[in-house]
Interface confidence: medium
């Protein structure tokens, strides 16, 4: 269950680092959303190798992706898993380690010389084969740092948000991904109640801009669950 995954996100005692200062003893630290990691020993830290619950790739490290730990496992329980090295099987770019991307279900090198012409091809073809995923979230590493000399403007093809200019994010549009504007206050946003639901979006929205969060519009509280309107609102 999700609770058991959350509870197993243990805190371990580590030896004091050389010259290392410490967090304030006895303080409690909360993770958003909703996970509490109590402080205590000065040199405690969250064990990076324990299951780390996630809802999307961006919540994991750049060398990880978010998925169910078991094949065909409970879709509601997802954790950060180590990225896959070259020539390993994949279903989307985020599964492949930095410097690689997913092509025809295999992690391949994102060599500058041949990759540029394949961006759109791989995004579109991955939808039509056995490994279709709609490329859930953008690749988060140095995958395309060499390819894009200037940041993508609105409408430019991208793989991840850092490929886009400031104020834009990389979001799905039909079967490819393009730079779209980050949402402003009052704009309709998408709140994913269940992991996996964003895989159904053909026209993905950006996230809310800085200082905003996606919340139910106040006058829509009475509406049924399925029709509740979410908008970007100030924290």
């Amino acid at each position: 269950t999700l609770n058991s995954v959350l509870n197993s996100n243990a805190i371990k005692n580590l030896p004091p680092p050389l010259g290392g200062a410490a967090g304030h003893p006895g303080s409690a630290v909360s993770a958003a959303p909703g996970i509490l990691y109590p402080g205590g020993n000065k040199y405690q830290t969250i064990d990076n190798y324990q299951p780390y619950p996630c809802a999307e790739d961006e919540e994991c490290g750049t060398d990880e992706y978010c998925a169910s730990p078991t094949r065909g496992g409970d879709a509601g329980v997802q954790i950060c898993l180590a990225c896959r090295k070259r020539r390993k099987r994949c279903m989307r770019h985020a599964m492949c380690c930095p410097g690689n991307y997913c092509k025809n279900g295999i992690c391949v090198s994102s060599d500058q010389n041949h990759f540029r012409g394949e961006i759109e091809e791989t995004i579109t073809e991955s939808f039509g084969n056995d490994h279709s995923t709609l490329d859930g979230y953008s690749r988060r590493t140095t995958l395309s740092s060499k390819m894009y000399h200037t940041k993508g403007q609105e409408g430019s093809v991208c793989l991840r948000s850092s490929d886009c200019a400031s104020g834009l994010c990389c979001a799905r549009h039909f079967w490819s991904k393009i730079c779209k504007p980050v949402l402003k206050e009052g704009q309709v946003c998408t709140k994913h109640r269940r992991k996996g639901s964003h895989g159904l979006e053909i026209f993905q929205r950006c996230y809310c801009g800085e200082g905003l969060s996606c919340r139910i519009q106040k006058d829509h509280h009475q509406a049924s669950n399925s029709s509740r309107l979410h908008t970007c609102q100030r924290h």
């Epitope: 680092p17 290392g20 200062a21 410490a22 967090g23 630290v29 993770a31 958003a32 990691y37 402080g39 000065k42 040199y43 405690q44 830290t45 969250i46 990076n48 780390y52 999307e56 961006e58 919540e59 994991c60 490290g61 750049t62 060398d63 990880e64 950060c80 988060r140 590493t141 140095t142 948000s161 850092s162």
Partner: nanobody, 125 residues
Framework: EVQLVESGGGLVQAGGSLRLSCTAS????????VGWFRQAPGKEREFVTG????????YYADSVKGRFTISRDNAKNTAYLQMNSLKPEDTAVYYC??????????????????WGQGTQVTVSS
């Protein structure tokens, strides 16, 4: 090598707001965890809040939860700390720090590699 520069500190009345900025030079910033720590006179430096490489995951000390908000703009190589409903006990030097890890699991000082010089925040009652 990443260099961090904090700005936005100052004197504010209790109940007021301040917004701190942490601007980084160096490429590693956009793929690393960023945290804010603070040190009040005569006290240890303590963790305030942290954010993972993408901004999708944030952590807060209980003492600031609901009042402080951390965010980042990787395109501008900048992290922000919005501090609302400030209290006199929030008075401290606030430090921005960046770690090598991309995950927001770094809650303690020794997990951070690069540090700013700090900016003073004083909350008067």
């Amino acid at each position: 090598e990443v260099q961090l520069v904090e700005s936005g500190g100052g004197l504010v009345q209790a109940g007021g707001s301040l917004r701190l900025s942490c601007t980084a030079s160096g490429r590693a910033f956009s793929s690393s965890v960023v945290g804010w720590f603070r040190q009040a006179p005569g006290k240890e430096r303590e963790f305030v809040t942290g954010i993972n490489w993408s901004g999708a995951r944030t952590y807060y000390a209980d003492s600031v939860k609901g009042r402080f908000t951390i965010s980042r703009d990787n395109a501008k190589n900048t992290a922000y700390l919005q501090m609302n409903s400030l209290k006199p006990e929030d008075t401290a030097v606030y430090y921005c720090a960046s770690g090598r890890d991309s995950r927001a699991r770094a809650l303690f000082e020794y997990e951070y590699v690069w540090w700013g010089q700090g900016t003073q925040v004083t909350v008067s009652s």
